[in-house]
């Protein structure tokens, strides 16, 4: 079964720069699985933002604008990040990563 | 059937204003973030504002900033474009795009030209 | 931001034969952020191709995408009377939101 491991604890920037997150991938091949990522904001329900699948499609959140949240992997690290554009304040939260395994 | 009927084009004099409206059906307007994109006379495609379904992420392009303000209605299922101290180089086709999940603009308005005169 | 340039800027083809356009991205950008847009005269734009291997409902499987990193192609295997029309790449992974110059397909 597969495992994620997101090592940042925190991540502090400035407003209106970039935050990277990762989530590392184990026990199972990355390219052969779909990654979601999530927020939780303080006091709200968690919120679905982005996946890339197995293929490298991306889906994301609707009432998102593109090119707010970006996702990826990386095979070779067997790592997905998550790339939040143009931080603000509502930005602020906890990011989770998950994995459906194909 | 998803529709995006403009409205509000026209001709504007430089240093003017003018509000573009964008009527959505077919779909939970509520739910999705919408653009508005222009193309200049024989000109390509350019990408001037975005803003989320809930209106609390709004985007615009840099040759727009602190002129232009995008807004929506969902109550109305309407986006809007409010164009202020409007220049030569704003002269175009305005089209309102809707943003799917799979982040292209999916549906787009018919297109509704504004013409700046000085 | 990101800057995508197109080429050719005109392409002179005829009905049958095989269209190869161009779209270099300035920055390396993921393939799952790339799109692909056709315009005809006096009509709104229409997606294609998004990402690396979508294709638009009703979108015929002549029309393919591929490419990574800086290069991507657009490749129209035969060309049918209705595809002479200008087509747009489109970055939408990050803010803002960038389009090609375009390339015209017309007839030879």
């Known amino acids: 079964a597969g495992h994620l491991e997101q090592p940042q604890i925190s991540s502090t920037k400035t407003l209106s720069k970039t935050a990277r997150l990762e989530c590392v991938v184990s026990g199972i091949t990355i390219s052969a699985t779909s990654v979601y990522w999530y927020r939780e904001r303080p006091g709200e329900v968690i919120q679905f933002l982005v996946s890339i699948s197995y293929d490298g499609t991306v889906r994301k959140e609707s009432g998102i604008p593109s090119g707010k949240f970006e996702v990826d992997r990386i095979p070779e690290t067997s790592t997905s990040t998550l790339t939040i554009h143009n931080v603000e304040k509502q930005d602020i939260a906890t990011y989770y990563c998950a994995l459906w395994e194909v | 059937e998803v529709q995006l009927v403009q409205s509000g084009g026209g001709l504007v004099k430089s240093g003017g204003s003018l509000r573009l409206s964008c009527a959505a059906s077919g779909f939970t307007f509520s739910t999705y973030s919408m653009n508005w994109v222009r193309q200049a006379p024989g000109k390509g495609l350019e990408w001037v504002s975005s803003?989320?379904?809930?209106?609390?992420?709004?985007f615009y392009a840099d040759s727009v900033k602190g002129r232009i303000i995008i807004s929506r209605d969902n109550a109305k299922n309407s986006l809007y474009l409010q164009m202020n101290s409007v220049r030569a180089d704003d002269t175009a086709v305005y089209y309102c795009?809707?943003?799917?999940?799979?982040?292209?603009?999916?549906?787009w308005g018919q297109g509704t030209l504004v013409t700046v005169s000085s | 931001e990101i800057v995508l340039t197109q080429s050719p800027g005109t392409l002179s083809l005829s009905a049958g034969e095989r269209a190869t356009l161009s779209c270099r991205a300035s920055?390396?950008?993921?393939?799952?952020?790339l799109a692909w847009y056709q315009q005809k005269p006096g009509q709104a734009p229409r997606v294609l191709i998004y990402?690396?291997?979508g294709r638009a409902t009703g979108i015929p499987d002549r029309f393919r995408g591929s490419g990574s990193g800086t290069d991507f192609t657009l490749t129209i295997s035969r060309l049918e009377p209705e595809d002479f029309a200008v087509y747009y790449c489109?970055?939408?992974?990050?803010?803002?939101?960038?389009f090609g110059g375009g390339t015209k397909v017309e007839i030879k």
């Open positions: 990402g690396p291997s």
């Open positions: 920055q390396s950008i993921s393939s799952s952020y």
């Open positions: 489109q970055q939408f992974g990050r803010s803002p939101l960038t």
């Open positions: 803003i989320s379904s809930s209106s609390s992420y709004i």
């Open positions: 795009a809707k943003d799917g999940e799979l982040g292209v603009f999916d549906y």
